[in-house]
Amino acid sequence: IPTEIPASALVKETLALLSTHRTLLIANETLRIPVPVHKNHQLCTEEIFQGIGTLESQTVQGGTVERLFKNLSLIKKYIGGQKKKCGEERRRVNQFLDYLQEFLGVMNTEWIIESH
Amino acid sequence: IPTEIPASALVKETLALLSTHRTLLIANETLRIPVPVHKNHQLCTEEIFQGIGTLESQTVQGGTVERLFKNLSLIKKYIGGQKKKCGEERRRVNQFLDYLQEFLGVMNTEWIIESH
């Protein structure tokens, strides 16, 4: 993401553009896109961006909807950068366990885990 | 995940086991494991479970520490199932946009986005 656009501002602007162009984006009534069936969004980034690609290929260009797709592409790049940072630093077991505990803690409190 | 263990209970039990066996797990002081450098845990599930695999191969098995790794393997399976559900259902653009908006909304409010 270009340093002149903080990721948080980019996400906010993208949300606004998404809302602005909704009518235009839903014009294609026959198009079907895979939609995750749970709310653990971060697990589904690949599928979300594949869906965005499908949508972009079916959407007219020329207007500010192009800005929306450009932003989404920057967000994809940002997330790609975050994924690279998942395995960049090798640390002591202690620190790995801290992270694992945090991960399970987040799973425990924030994940939407459907009851069986 | 076996129906007799709800995922939420499994996570809780795993957290307790992790805390119990911490001293045993950190015994290997030379071992280095990749640790994500940000807190968007769901993006890093692959690396986390690779780390768990490394740790398991270096840990003396037996007793309840085996139970810990069995649980972690079930959680991995659960997450794999969730990932499969990312692209299972094809829906209208409208529903995809709802999900995308929700994803960006969560990014906006809950993700830890480092400032540039």
């Epitope: 602005t20 260009q61 207007g63 500010t64 800005r67 | -």
Partner: antibody
Framework: EVQLQQSLAELVRPGASVTLSCTAS????????IHWVKQRPEQGLEWIGR????????KHGPKFQGKATITADTSSNTAYLQFSSLTSEDTAIYYC?????????WGQGTPLTVSS | QIVLTQSPALMSASPGEKVTMTCSAS?????IYWYQQKPRSSPKPWIY???TLASGVPARFSGSGSGTSFSLTISRMEAEDAATYYC?????????FGGGTKLEIE
């Protein structure tokens, strides 16, 4: 009220350069894209190119690459179309229009006559 | 680039008559936009996204089509509909216009 006011008719010599302007009122050009179109006497419409005034990003039709330069000044809410090395083939009416969600508002056109 | 061919180039219709003009694309496009232009005036956006009428366009106008074949229809011709109609694609650069259909009143 949304309006695009274009500069007045121009009569120029072959080989000269000219800059046409398109001044917006009732909206901020940064929130839209501005396009330019050429219409030769008794002929159809030709897309010249467009600018995203928010960042200066431009795209041109291949026929106008190197011939036409599109710029924008957000402080005066104005877009410009500059031509170099004019020939009689450039004699036409030039229109600007805005494209937000839809290409909805056009200027009144600037007639350009290239003649010795 | 995508070439749009409009036909007929020139047509005339009597008041009350149904009018159909077509726009054919050299390769598949998602949508077609239509503009109306009268002499000494700027083009006016007329139909968006193949079938959505622009603000103020009378309901006797309709647009349809998909892929490479599109059309604009006037259910009952009126004198004020006499104009040139252009189709345009926003599918890929460069954005191209059709050559236009000039509609005259008989």
């Amino acid at each position: 009220e949304v309006q695009l006011q274009q500069s007045l008719a121009e009569l120029v010599r072959p080989g000269a350069s000219v800059t046409l302007s398109c001044t917006a009122s009732g909206f901020n050009i940064k929130n839209t894209y501005i396009h330019w179109v050429k219409q030769r006497p008794e002929q159809g419409l030709e897309w010249i190119g467009r600018i995203d005034p928010a960042n200066g990003d431009t795209k041109h039709g291949p026929k106008f690459q190197g011939k036409a330069t599109i710029t924008a000044d957000t402080s005066s809410n104005t877009a410009y179309l500059q031509f170099s090395s004019l020939t009689s083939e450039d004699t036409a009416i030039y229109y600007c229009f805005r494209y937000g969600i839809y290409p909805d508002h056009w200027g009144q056109g600037t007639p350009l006559t290239v003649s010795s | 680039q995508i070439v749009l061919t409009q036909s007929p180039a020139l047509m005339s219709a009597s008041p009350g008559e149904k009018v159909t003009m077509t726009c054919s694309a050299s390769s598949s496009v998602n949508y077609i936009y239509w503009y109306q232009q009268k002499p000494r005036s700027s083009p006016k956006p007329w139909i968006y996204l193949t079938a959505t009428l622009a603000s103020g366009v009378p309901a006797r106008f309709s647009g349809s089509g998909s892929g490479t074949s599109f059309s604009l229809t006037i259910s009952r011709m009126e004198a004020e509909d006499a104009a040139t109609y252009y189709c345009q694609q926003w599918n890929s650069y460069p954005y191209t216009f059709g050559g236009g259909t000039k509609l005259e009143i008989e």
